[in-house]
Structure formats: structure tokens, C-alpha cells
């Protein structure tokens, strides 16, 4: 499965939109910084078959989409930017879903993927727990925005490596 060129453009657009969504200085929120345990090893791309990598990317985008689709998120960000960001993520999910079906087959999800997917879910659970504990404060959302920018950058790099393998 070849991810369309528009997919990588969408990736870059999503990162630009997320950067634009920043409302307060990251420096004013340094005291709120937090380690969410991003599973970098799941995104280095070396030990992966393509189907595995696509499934992990899909989970990453899906969880990001879920995180920014909540009521609390709607209250935190400028609505038009949030909508554009969500639309980019939704398009990426469609591209990746088409690839998952092509690479893996409609019926089976390889069990070898599951541990990697669970690592991504665990990471997002820690993000949602942090937001809850911080009562969805502006600084908490800023910390999370910066964190998601970092994790989406890893996703973008993994996608680049996948294209080079093709």
C-alpha cells in the first residue's frame, strides 16, 4: 500500500495547525511539564513490518483525534483551528484505514501488533489522566499540545521511513 502524497502533506498541515493552536507561552507552563512515557521504540520503524507500522500509526492518529474531539478540548482551543486540525486527522485515518485493509486483510489483526498498539493507548491514558488531575487548565492543555506535536513528529518520521522502504 502506498500512502498518497496528500497524506504526508496532511501530516505537515496537522503539525502546522497544532503549532498555531498554541495560546500561551510554553515557558509560562514549565512548572506543569510532565513525562507521559511516549513509546519512542514503537516508532523507530526498524523492527516493524509495514502492516505493523501502519497499525501503530493508525492508533496514534486515532487517539490524537479522540483526545481533541472531547468537550473539554472544544473549550480549550480556537474553534476553526480545532476543526481544521480534526479534519486533517480524519483524512489521515481514512488513508491509513485503507492501507490497514490492504496490508493486513479485512479479517485479521496480527497479534504481534497488539503490544505496540497497547503501548500507544497507555501513553494516551496517561495524557488524559494528567488533564483530569490538572482540571483541564490552560497550562495543562499547552503541555499536552506540545507533547502531541512531539509524538506526531515521530509519526511523520516513521511514515517517511515507510515511503523510503517502498
Amino acid at each position: 500500500c502506498d500512502l498518497p502524497q496528500t497524506h504526508s502533506l496532511g501530516n505537515r498541515r496537522a503539525l502546522i495547525l497544532l503549532a498555531q493552536m498554541g495560546r500561551i507561552s510554553h515557558f509560562s507552563c514549565l512548572k506543569d511539564r510532565h513525562d507521559f512515557g511516549f513509546p519512542e521504540e514503537e516508532f523507530d520503524g526498524h523492527q516493524f513490518q509495514k502492516a505493523q507500522a501502519i497499525s501503530v500509526l493508525h492508533e496514534m492518529i486515532q487517539q490524537t483525534f479522540n483526545l481533541f474531539s472531547t468537550e473539554d478540548s472544544s473549550a480549550a482551543w480556537e474553534q476553526s483551528l480545532l476543526e481544521k486540525f480534526s479534519t486533517e486527522l480524519y483524512q489521515q485515518l481514512n488513508d491509513l484505514e485503507a492501507c490497514v485493509i490492504q496490508e493486513v486483510g479485512v479479517e485479521e489483526t496480527p497479534l504481534m501488533n497488539e503490544d505496540s498498539i497497547l503501548a500507544v493507548r497507555k501513553y494516551f491514558q496517561r495524557i488524559t489522566l494528567y488533564l483530569t488531575e490538572k482540571k483541564y487548565s490552560p497550562c495543562a492543555w499547552e503541555v499536552v499540545r506540545a507533547e502531541i506535536m512531539r509524538s506526531l513528529s515521530f509519526s511523520t518520521n516513521l511514515q517517511k521511513r515507510l515511503r523510503r522502504k517502498d
Epitope: D35, G37, P39, E59, Q62, Q63, N66, D115, S116, L118, A119, R121, K122, F124, Q125, R126, T128
Partner: antibody
């Protein structure tokens, strides 16, 4: 096959320290939370604490915070529960459990160890 | 803490019967309800997760339903293996909490 194998029963005196273990196998250790659950004989289940083996990030039940501590050794895929000073009221069966996480981030306990009986008596 | 209250605390039934156990949460837990069975001298085992999903390998005579503050576990066509203690659990809020248990014994 996913397995959580716990150490055997322990008999201790009040004031003594103790560390019990849970050795896991059959999956990627760092991808799943592990919790400890207490069951006082003849009573119900109480969730104590959970740990992310990837970086030892922990979440405690406030009822147990300060009295027990959880830790992991990634090199031997083992989770520990430790007391520095046991009390008679710690007499119970302790289970280690693996969490599964759904896509909507719902936790549930899909695999349980066989349990370790800890008896504290003078 | 979210309190989980099971009813009844105990019940008697015969092989082949159907039984229903109810669990009430002190506040909404969405569908973060789970059910476990504990046989005497054994560790608990997962039966139902997220209120209504059957765990792999669990017979279809077990069904779960409900969401919000109440959920139910129904067991149809009771088998000898089913006489045990059943616990509900919520994982919506910390600390995670269990119901006090329902002991199902032979009439």
C-alpha cells in the same frame, strides 16, 4: 501464553519488612499496566496500586499510599509489592493483575496471578 | 471514591436455572463496568468487560448489560462450575473499586 506467576506464601511478624514478587511472561512487559489487588480472607477485592513498567510511573489507591510500594525490574520482567513494616491487618491474599486497555481507554483486568498469601502474626 | 453495591449479596439456585446480579455505582461510570468470577481457593477471572463485552473463552450463557450507574450480569442455564462468588468493578475513576461480591450457591 500470558502468565503472571507469584511467589509462595509468607509468614511474618508485625514490624517486619516483606517484598513479594510477580514474574510475567508471554507478552511485551512494558506495554501493559500491572496492578496489585488485596483480598482479606473471606472478604472482597480491593485495588491497591498500578504501575507502568516502561518507566515505573505509579498510581496508588490513597488507602494504601505510604504503607506499601510497588516497583519493577524490567530486566527480569518482575513486579514487586513491598512493606517496610507489616501489620496484622496486612494479612491477606495479594494478586498481581495485568490491565488490558480498549481503544476508548477503558481498563480491565484480563490476566491474574495465582495470588500470594501473606500472614502477619506475632 | 465511587461505591459499588451489588445485589443480592447471596443467592441460591440449581443447575439449569437463570440468575441475574445487579451492580449500582454511586455515580455514573459510563460503560466502565466489568464482571469477574471467583471460584473457591482460586484467583478471580474476567467474564465481561465494558459492561457488555464477553471475554474471549467465556461461554455465551454469561451476558452483561447496562451503563451509567447500573449494570447487570445474567447467567442462563447454570452449570456446576458457576457456583462461585461474582464481583463487579468500575475503572472510570480512581481508586478503582469492586462490589462487595455476590455468592451464588446450590439450592
Amino acid at each position: 501464553e500470558v502468565q503472571l506467576v507469584q511467589a509462595g506464601a509468607e509468614v511474618k511478624a508485625p514490624g517486619e519488612s516483606l517484598r513479594i514478587s510477580c514474574k510475567v511472561s508471554g507478552y511485551t512487559f512494558t506495554s501493559y499496566w500491572i496492578s496489585w489487588v488485596r483480598q482479606i480472607p473471606g472478604k472482597g477485592l480491593e485495588w491497591m496500586v498500578k504501575i507502568d513498567p516502561r518507566d515505573s510511573y505509579t498510581i496508588y489507591n490513597p488507602s494504601f499510599q505510604g504503607h506499601v510500594s510497588i516497583s519493577v525490574d524490567k530486566s527480569i520482567t518482575t513486579v514487586y509489592l513491598q512493606w517496610s513494616s507489616l501489620q496484622a491487618s496486612d494479612t491477606a491474599i495479594y494478586y498481581c493483575v495485568r490491565h488490558y486497555l480498549t481503544q476508548s481507554l477503558v481498563d480491565y483486568f484480563d490476566h491474574w496471578g495465582q495470588g500470594t498469601l501473606v500472614a502477619v502474626s506475632s | 471514591d465511587i461505591q459499588m453495591t451489588q445485589s443480592p449479596s447471596s443467592l441460591s439456585a440449581s443447575v439449569g436455572d437463570s440468575v441475574t446480579i445487579t451492580c449500582r455505582a454511586s455515580q455514573s461510570v459510563s460503560n466502565y463496568f466489568h464482571w469477574y468470577r471467583q471460584k473457591p481457593g482460586k484467583a478471580p477471572e474476567l467474564l465481561i468487560y465494558s459492561a457488555s463485552n464477553l471475554q474471549t473463552g467465556v461461554p455465551s450463557r454469561f451476558t452483561g448489560s447496562g451503563s451509567g450507574t447500573e449494570c447487570t450480569l445474567t447467567i442462563t442455564s447454570l452449570q456446576p462450575d458457576d457456583f462461585a462468588t461474582y464481583y463487579c468493578q468500575q475503572t472510570h475513576g480512581y481508586p478503582f473499586t469492586f462490589g462487595q461480591g455476590t455468592k451464588l450457591d446450590v439450592r
